[in-house]
């Protein structure tokens, strides 16, 4: 069954945590649907964003952070492992120095930590997708 | 009650027709939600777009057409009559030479016809909004 979009969930992250998302674009790639995943510092959507991950399907991926209300330097990738009309599985793993983003089991993007992952309190998944799975797994201490 | 988004409806347009849309952005303007309205030449989403109207709330509006599968010259406006967090009413009227877009009763944007409005067969409303009303009114002959 489908999860509501935008989908918001409280989360605590640290090295070893993984966020897993399963979904499908709502439009053909010609129409450039978006997927966005934001790791927020508060439960409020206006809060700072530790890791912003935005896919313009079929075109590009941009990653960034929003600190003290201001967007910082954007990182762009033309790598496009997503398939038009197909379901995707996205997993974002917290490594000691960066986030590693896997798409359908394939390492596709990385983003160096700018703010400690422990600052994350909420994850939001939104834009032009249907969402079937959202999970945060925590490393067993 | 809410209409599904993306929302797609068959439509025939000509001079005097008006498309009316009521909705609300799904996120605060800081997060740059989008609204998109596309007038298509076929019932298929990959078809050409006679009039493409995309709002990046709080930032800008772009208008364009997609002809023989290719985007043409974009028209951009910084005019932003939409209010953060507020419901909007959008009406797109077909004039003899252009589309006139009204936001909350105020004339806000125009776009000269590149393709005859009679080529429109479908209207799609989508991206980051909740939709409460969609109506196409036809001029009484």
């Amino acid at each position: 069954s489908l999860l509501p979009v935008p989908y918001t969930e409280a989360a605590s992250l640290s090295t070893g945590s993984t966020v897993t998302i399963k979904g499908r674009p709502l439009a053909c790639f010609l129409n450039e649907p978006y997927l966005q995943v934001d790791f927020h510092t508060e439960m409020k959507e206006e809060s700072d964003i530790v890791f912003h991950f935005q896919v313009c399907f079929g075109r590009r991926v941009v990653m960034n952070s929003r600190e003290y209300g201001a967007w910082k330097q954007q990182v762009e990738s033309k790598n496009m492992p997503f398939q038009d009309g197909q379901e995707f599985e996205l997993s974002i793993s917290v490594l000691p120095d960066k986030y590693q983003v896997m798409v359908n089991g394939q390492s596709s993007y990385t983003f160096d930590h700018r703010i400690k992952p422990e600052a994350v309190k909420m994850v939001q998944v939104w834009r032009d997708i249907s969402l079937t799975k959202f999970n945060v797994s925590y490393l067993k201490r | 009650s809410l209409l599904p988004v993306p929302y797609t409806e068959a439509a025939s347009l000509s001079t005097g027709s008006t498309v009316t849309i009521k909705g609300r952005p799904l996120a605060c303007f800081l997060n740059e939600p989008y609204l998109q309205v596309d007038f298509h030449t076929e019932m298929k989403e990959e078809s050409d777009i006679v009039f493409h109207f995309q709002v990046c709330f709080g930032r800008r509006v772009v208008m364009n057409s997609r002809e023989y599968g290719a985007w043409k010259q974009q028209v951009e406006s910084k005019n932003m009559p939409f209010q953060d967090g507020q419901e909007f009413e959008l009406s797109i009227s077909v004039l003899p030479d252009k589309y006139q877009v009204m936001v909350n009763g105020q004339s806000s944007y125009t776009f000269d016809h590149r393709i005859k409005p009679e080529a429109v067969k479908m209207v799609q409303v989508w991206r980051d909004i909740s939709l409460t009303k969609f109506n196409v009114s036809y001029l009484k002959r």
Partner: antibody, heavy 116, light 112 residues
Framework: QVQLVESGGGLVQPGGSLRLSCAAS????????MSWVRQAPGKGPEWVSD????????YYADSVKGRFTISRDNAKNSLLLQMNSLKPEDTAVYYC?????????WGQGTQVTVSS | QTVVTQEPSLSVSPGGTVTLTCGLS?????????PAWYQQTPGQAPRALIY???SRHSGVPDRFSGSISGNKAALTITGAQAEDEADYYC????????????FGGGTHLTVL
């Protein structure tokens, strides 16, 4: 990119027949109306015939009505013009073309010469 | 029968500006006629330049511009170049049905 390539022209005697073809690529052929336009030597272009995207509606210039038949095969991305009872005044370069309220894209043309 | 009128010939100096017009034998050209302009050089197929009054096709230099002026459609070439010497045709859209796109007789432009 959009490409239209005509073929099937040639020299034919008055009263004879020819079948012109236009192979389309680079766009979703079945979504678009198509036209044949001809240009006689030293003259301007002249509309000959139209067919709508599904093939259900066809239109002809008075000068060719009853002699020419336009058709299309959307599965093969192909536009056809069957020309019967040809006359010397049908001598022209024949172009296939497409557009919404004009002719955005043209083929390179195929020469038809009707002469004894 | 609809007749679309154009100047048979015009000339322009290199670097100069010239305006070609496209009219109707009876009545005015309006936006609903979606005037379009084409360029043809000897031995070549016509090439679409402008459609829907003033929209340029991709790859068309911006020295070509379209408008409606008075009761006619117009094509203006600003900063004419030697390669602009050609025949120019306009079409007007006359509504749905048979022969809905009508050609003008053409203008031969000489760049002196």
């Amino acid at each position: 990119q959009v490409q239209l390539v005509e073929s099937g022209g040639g020299l034919v005697q008055p009263g004879g027949s020819l079948r012109l073809s236009c192979a389309a690529s680079g766009f979703t052929f079945g979504n678009y109306d198509m036209s044949w336009v001809r240009q006689a030597p030293g003259k301007g272009p002249e509309w000959v015939s139209d067919i709508n995207s599904g093939g259900g509606s066809t239109y002809y210039a008075d000068s060719v009505k009853g002699r020419f038949t336009i058709s299309r095969d959307n599965a093969k991305n192909s536009l056809l013009l069957q020309m019967n009872s040809l006359k010397p005044e049908d001598t022209a370069v024949y172009y296939c073309a497409t557009g919404y309220t004009g002719y955005y894209y043209w083929g390179q043309g195929t020469q038809v010469t009707v002469s004894s | 029968q609809t007749v679309v009128t154009q100047e048979p010939s015009l000339s322009v100096s290199p670097g100069g500006t010239v305006t070609l017009t496209c009219g109707l034998s009876s009545g005015s050209v309006t936006s609903s006629n979606y005037p379009a302009w084409y360029q043809q050089t000897p031995g070549q197929a016509p090439r679409a330049l402008i459609y829907s009054i003033n929209s340029r096709h991709s790859g068309v230099p911006d020295r070509f511009s379209g408008s409606i002026s008075g009761n006619k459609a117009a094509l203006t070439i600003t900063g004419a170049q030697a390669e602009d010497e050609a025949d120019y045709y306009c079409t007007l859209y006359m509504g749905t049905g048979s022969n809905n796109v009508v050609f003008g007789g053409g203008t031969h432009l000489t760049v002196l």
